[in-house]
């Protein structure tokens, strides 16, 4: 089969594609982000980076491929760069920046039922225990109906 995909040029901000093998069918382009601590992920059509809900766990993507139909897969327009996870998950401090499904809710550090010390300690220190450092993990005991009154966020 012959032909090639068009040069992927309408990229979302901070996304970079490297296509060492060109754009022929079967060629792969590596995805990366200009910001060193961001990761390339696929978002649904109606979701932007600015309004990703904490419960959304987008799929990481490392490459796109030129298909036989001369289309890139996944489509580059669906690939975005999001803040990566800081390497402080499961260390007994609830890091606001990691309190999202994509970072496994900071490894359990933001819920009384899952943090090892059984006391949520926020970081930054001013992080609101009812806001960015709240217990958001839907799997935590705090969110099972029978235990709703059994745990506090403090």
């Amino acid at each position: 089969m012959q032909g090639q995909c068009s040069v992927p040029n309408e990229l979302n901000s901070n996304l970079k594609l490297q296509c060492p093998d060109g754009y022929a069918i079967g060629s792969e382009c590596a995805t990366s982000c200009l910001d060193h601590n961001s990761e390339s992920i696929i978002l649904p059509m109606n979701v932007t980076v600015r309004d990703i809900p904490h419960w959304l766990n987008p799929t990481r993507v490392e490459r796109v491929v030129c298909t036989a139909g001369l289309k890139w897969y996944p489509h580059p327009a669906l690939i975005h760069c999001v803040k990566g996870c800081e390497p402080f998950m499961g260390d007994n401090y609830c890091d606001a920046i990691n309190n999202r499904a994509f970072c496994n809710y900071d490894g359990g550090d933001c819920c009384t039922s899952t943090v090892k010390t059984k006391k949520v300690t926020p970081f930054p220190m001013s992080c609101d225990l009812q806001g960015d450092c709240a217990c958001r993990d839907p799997q935590a005991q705090e969110h099972s109906r029978k235990d709703l009154r059994g745990y506090s966020h403090g």
């Epitope: 060193h36 890091d95 010390t117 300690t121 220190m125 001013s126």
Partner: antibody, heavy 119, light 107 residues
Framework: EVQLVQSGAEVKKPGESLKISCKGS????????TGWVRQAPGKGLEWMGI????????RYSPSFQGQVTISADKSISTAYLQWSSLKASDTAVYYC????????????WGQGTMVTVSS | EIVMTQSPATLSVSPGERATLSCRAS??????LAWYQQKPGQAPRLLIY???TRATGIPARFSGSGSGTEFTLTISSLQSEDFAVYYC?????????FGGGTKVEIK
């Protein structure tokens, strides 16, 4: 008057152990976290770690993890910084500083403890 | 870790003049930025927190601005007691990091 009073200057040999202290007074110790900051001679400030008032959870900057131990005894309103085996590169002034639990910035600092490590 | 870069390393200013110090973060820290003043043989003193809020007892000639990655400390009219080293610090992402400092000296 709110104060953080640190223990006095120390001169040690490489390989020796050391524990320096920071005693808080004039405020409720359990309403504040305590941080430790290093300043090597002629150099800038380096954040070492913090401890919350319960004394059970300390958090270390990666470059100090495993090199020092931060602890606290809330019954005597005192935080500690200790080394099990000092190195010449540990020579520095060490400051303790306190911050309110819902604040990210230390509002009161100790006077500093000079630690000299030399053979 | 987030790297904080201060410029210039040394600033020579005459008393009464305006001093502008810069601090750049390697990634966004929102408005989580503090400025400290340190004089020889003394502990640092908090001047500004959350980017632009003056700490208790700090004179109005000190002001902070900026957010994200670019921050500025301005001293509107330098007094003799303002000659010191100034550090910026971010407490947004662990580890907390300081800039290398800017020394403000008499011209």
């Amino acid at each position: 008057e709110v104060q953080l009073v640190q223990s006095g200057a120390e001169v040690k040999k490489p390989g020796e152990s050391l524990k320096i202290s920071c005693k808080g007074s004039g405020y409720s110790f359990t309403s504040y976290w305590t941080g430790w900051v290093r300043q090597a001679p002629g150099k800038g400030l380096e954040w070492m770690g913090i401890i919350y008032p319960g004394g059970s959870v300390a958090r270390y900057s990666p470059s100090f993890q495993g090199q020092v131990t931060i602890s606290a005894d809330k019954s005597i309103s005192t935080a500690y910084l200790q080394w099990s085996s000092l190195k010449a590169s540990d020579t520095a002034v060490y400051y303790c500083a306190r911050g309110p639990l819902r604040s990210d910035y230390p509002d009161v600092w100790g006077q500093g403890t000079m630690v000299t490590v030399s053979s | 870790e987030i790297v904080m870069t201060q410029s210039p390393a040394t600033l020579s200013v005459s008393p009464g003049e305006r001093a502008t110090l810069s601090c750049r973060a390697s990634q966004s820290v929102g408005s989580y930025l503090a400025w400290y003043q340190q004089k020889p043989g003394q502990a640092p003193r908090l001047l500004i927190y959350r980017g632009s809020t003056r700490a208790t007892g700090i004179p109005a000639r000190f002001s902070g601005s900026g957010s994200g990655t670019e921050f500025t400390l301005t001293i509107s009219s330098l007094q003799s007691e303002d000659f010191a080293v100034y550090y910026c610090q971010q407490p947004y992402v662990w580890p907390i990091t300081f800039g290398g400092g800017t020394k403000v000296e008499i011209k």
